[in-house]
């Protein structure tokens, strides 16, 4: 089960990465991205 | 940030709303419309992105469009009707992991549409 | 489309009480959610903004939480100037329609 949690967790993180990206494009980039913990 | 071009039209007249900006350079920012009906809540219309790629809200889409010049940045409205009645305001929205003080708004210019 | 639902609408509060203002995202936006104090005749304030970072300028009384769907606003030691409405915006990404922002419906906050 705690596979399943880091599994869930980690895909999480990776959309997250990839919205951040998207979102940057169109607001613009000025600083290190960075992704708050929960 | 000040908004311009607010009146009192008729229903169906177009309107074209100017947002212009002074001391910083609309490459570097992503400037967004919002509107505000008299006494209601804050309404989401669309977005001009650093990319000069426009977005808008689904209920917006076909008749407001988003443009911008070194200087300004347009809101063009299309078939208005007295629901569009309200004060649109331009944004200057916060870059990526930004300041909070990029985030500017206008004072605001009121459209009012009745017959 | 994003949807954003702010509850209450109306709260009312003593001087130096709390208040808790809750939203709801209908999809996941992570932490891209702010939160705007406007007062009447006047353009909104950014308070909050990536859920929980405070604006420059904004006492320490007003404080913001949550990830994914569910955000809280909270004013601790209400002041009389904090009587305003309150909205949240969200910011999300879709695949195929991409940027989207939507703001809550507002919570009138009434200081007692």
């Known amino acids: 089960h705690s596979d399943g949690i880091f599994t869930d967790s980690y895909s999480r993180y990776r959309k997250q990465m990839a919205v951040k990206k998207y979102l940057a494009a169109v607001l613009g980039k000025r600083y290190k991205q960075r992704v708050k913990n929960k | 940030v000040e908004e311009s071009g607010g009146r009192l039209v008729t229903p169906g007249t177009p309107l074209t709303l100017t947002c212009t900006v002074s001391?910083?350079?609309?490459?570097?920012?992503?400037m967004s419309w919002v509107r505000q009906a008299p006494g209601k809540g804050l309404e989401w219309i669309g977005i001009m992105g650093v990319n000069d790629i426009t977005y808008y809200a689904s209920w917006a889409k076909g008749r407001f469009t988003i443009s911008k010049t070194s200087t300004t940045v347009d809101l063009k409205m299309t078939s208005l009707t007295t629901e569009d009645t309200a004060t649109y305001f331009c944004?200057?929205?916060?870059?990526?992991?930004?300041?909070?003080?990029?985030?500017?708004w206008g004072p605001g210019t009121l459209v009012t549409v009745s017959s | 489309a994003i949807k954003m639902t702010q509850t209450p609408s109306s709260v009312s509060a003593a001087v130096g009480g709390t208040v808790t203002i809750n939203c709801q995202a209908s999809e996941d936006i992570y932490t891209n959610l702010a939160w705007y104090q406007q007062k009447p005749g006047q353009p909104p304030n950014l308070l909050i903004y990536?859920?929980?970072d405070l604006a420059s300028g904004v006492p320490s009384r007003f404080s913001g939480s949550g990830d994914g769907t569910q955000f809280t606003l909270t004013i601790s030691a209400v002041q009389c100037e904090d009587a305003a409405t309150y909205y949240c915006?969200?910011?999300?990404?879709?695949?195929?329609?991409?940027?989207?922002?939507?703001f809550g419906g507002g919570t009138e906050v009434v200081v007692k």
């Open positions: 915006q969200g910011v999300a990404w879709s695949s195929n329609t991409g940027y989207g922002s939507a």
């Open positions: 001391g910083f350079s609309l490459n570097n920012y992503a």
């Open positions: 944004t200057r929205e916060i870059r990526d992991d930004g300041d909070s003080s990029d985030k500017l």
């Open positions: 990536d859920a929980s």
